[in-house]
């Protein structure tokens, strides 16, 4: 059907609460395009009727709420004047009952649900809430180990929980809760966050430092092969994950089918006070869809991107 297939993974979903996914794929969705959502290769589009439990809301697919049987592969088809892209999103629904029972415990937590606070610093946790404009979010309540958080060290500011003078006791299992209103109906959103504490290290903080990239652009010709290194310094005893992501998905998962873009093997050099890590990303063949897309190098809580751009035309 002439559509370019793009595969991505998205697995951390909770039954019995709202969930939304926005079909964005820059630079494709930045122009004049139409977006249509489908489930499991069905020819019938997802309903656009706002009363439907599952419906399309502009470029979003919205579940009010998500149910156990909603697991599956969803496709959003982005049609432009001269292009067609089909993004496959694999949604797996889990029961989340952390404060009710440990039975059916949470699966492996995605990065949004794993956060770090820095010992002795003023720091914050973020409640990740991704919903379309039609969803009105109420004030956020925060919980730690199933009890509501109170005390002057904690301040709620928009979607963040500010924690002053972080102590070792602040590690644990947090949850942010918000009431979402849509078309007059109310739904509860509860996101669990597992929080670890990290200490500042001798060489200037245990937050990994990304030496390169620097949120910069690279000029590269269409069709060429490109390898970009991500260079990171970190403490010797760190347990940080280092990886390349695109659209908040590991590149190896995002390009799972074509394997056109892959993450390389991590190497490191050991210095007296820190380690220098290198993990590369390889573009076997740069395609038009790669331009303008931020390819993010992640190291623990640090991140930096490169963006590919076409070389400026040579008018000589």
């Amino acid at each position: 059907d002439g559509c370019n297939d793009i595969f991505m993974k998205n697995e951390m979903l909770s039954a019995s609460q709202p969930f939304a996914f926005n079909c964005t794929f820059p630079p494709i969705t930045s122009g004049e395009v139409s977006v249509t959502w489908y489930k499991n290769s069905s020819k019938i589009p997802v309903s656009k009727i706002i009363q439907s439990r599952i419906h399309q809301d502009e470029t979003w697919i919205l579940f009010l709420p998500m149910e156990w049987g909603d697991s599956g592969v969803y496709q959003c088809v982005i049609k432009g004047r001269d292009s067609c892209h089909r993004i496959h999103v694999n949604l797996t629904v889990f029961e989340k009952q952390w404060c009710d029972t440990s039975v059916k415990g949470l699966p492996n937590l995605s990065d949004e649900y794993k956060q770090i606070l820095h010992l002795g610093k003023d720091d914050s946790l973020t409640c990740h809430l991704h919903f379309p404009k039609s969803c009105i979010l109420g004030p956020i309540k925060w919980y730690k180990d199933c009890n509501e958080i109170t005390g002057e060290r904690f301040t709620v500011l928009e979607t963040r929980l500010l924690v002053s003078n972080v102590s070792a006791e602040d590690r644990g299992n947090y949850a942010c809760q918000v009431i979402l209103t849509h078309s007059g109906k109310q739904y509860e959103v509860l996101n669990g966050i597992t929080v670890s504490i990290t200490e500042r290290a001798g060489y200037g903080g245990s937050v990994p430092k990304i030496i390169y990239p620097k949120n910069n652009s690279i000029e590269v010709q269409l069709g060429t092969t490109l390898i970009v290194d991500c260079n990171i310094t970190d403490t010797k005893d760190n347990t940080n994950l280092r990886c390349w992501r695109v659209n908040n998905t590991l590149v190896d998962d995002y390009y799972n089918e074509s394997k056109r873009i892959r993450e390389g093997v991590e190497t490191h050099a050991s210095f007296r006070e820190y380690n220098l890590y290198t993990v590369n990303i390889t573009f076997l063949e740069v395609k038009m869809e790669d331009y303008g897309l931020p390819f993010m190098c992640h190291a623990g809580v640090s991140a930096a991107y490169i963006m590919l751009q076409l070389p400026a035309p040579d008018f000589r």
């Epitope: 039975v103 415990g105 492996n108 937590l109 180990d145 199933c146 597992t194």
Partner: antibody, heavy 119, light 108 residues
Framework: QVQLVQSGAEVKKPGASVKVSCKAS????????MHWAKQAPGQGLEWIGE????????NYNQKFQGRVTMTRDTSISTAYMELSRLRSDDTAVYYC????????????WGQGTLVTVSS | QIVLTQSPGTLSLSPGERATLSCRAS???????LHWYQQKPGQAPRLWIY???SRATGIPDRFSGSGSGTDFTLTISRLEPEDFATYYC?????????FGQGTKLEIK
């Protein structure tokens, strides 16, 4: 390192109650569910229930409902399992076991407490 | 409740041999929620394999787990003397949590 240390062996008469303790160390006691399991002599394992030490929320196996009470004392990081109206078939080793958030399995176990019910 | 049936009840093998322990569930269990424990006489159970196929810390790679749905297997590729014990499968999918009745692995 994580340790769960249980109270010593008990001998009880039928109809009496027993309260077994499980003292936790090496982790934040209030952040993980604590479970209890029973193992009768020469038999397999049977789940009794769970308690969340921070909220004191409990969930019991229907089979033990009405006879089991799980409590905790956060000041001394200790969980308790009390079994009442004891019968001879309650003779068993009782274990506490901890479940980490996001890791639904028993990674840590107490050493076990033998409860003997005999007239 | 989910009933887990282990077979065989007792398995008599010699060191160096391969052991295959089976665990069958009365209804489907997600692979994330099926675990194996080893227990030796007079000791508490010890986590051996979690989420069907992941070895717990310090467990040698001669142990492997597999399966899905209702049929799960624990395999020991080459038995060592210290492997002789009782192995229990356990599900964490629905309440009440249940264990299999155990497979006793004994020296022939």
């Amino acid at each position: 390192q994580v340790q769960l240390v249980q109270s010593g062996a008990e001998v009880k008469k039928p109809g009496a109650s027993v309260k077994v303790s499980c003292k936790a160390s090496g982790y934040t006691f209030t952040s993980s569910w604590m479970h209890w399991a029973k193992q009768a002599p020469g038999q397999g394992l049977e789940w009794i229930g769970e308690i969340h030490p921070n909220s004191a929320k409990t969930n019991y196996n229907q089979k033990f409902q009405g006879r089991v009470t799980m409590t905790r004392d956060t000041s001394i990081s200790t969980a308790y399992m009390e079994l009442s109206r004891l019968r001879s078939d309650d003779t068993a080793v009782y274990y506490c076991a901890r479940v980490d958030y996001g890791k639904p399995w028993f990674a840590y176990w107490g050493q076990g407490t033998l409860v003997t019910v005999s007239s | 409740q989910i009933v887990l049936t282990q077979s065989p009840g007792t398995l008599s093998l010699s060191p160096g041999e391969r052991a295959t322990l089976s665990c069958r569930a009365s209804s489907s269990v997600s692979s994330s929620y099926l675990h194996w424990y080893q227990q030796k006489p007079g000791q508490a159970p010890r986590l051996w394999i979690y989420s069907t196929s992941s070895r717990a810390t310090g467990i040698p790679d001669r142990f492997s787990g597999s399966g899905s749905g209702t049929d799960f297997t624990l395999t020991i590729s080459r038995l060592e003397p210290e492997d002789f014990a009782t192995y229990y499968c356990q599900q964490f999918q629905s309440s009440p949590l249940t264990f299999g009745q155990g497979t006793k692995l004994e020296i022939k």
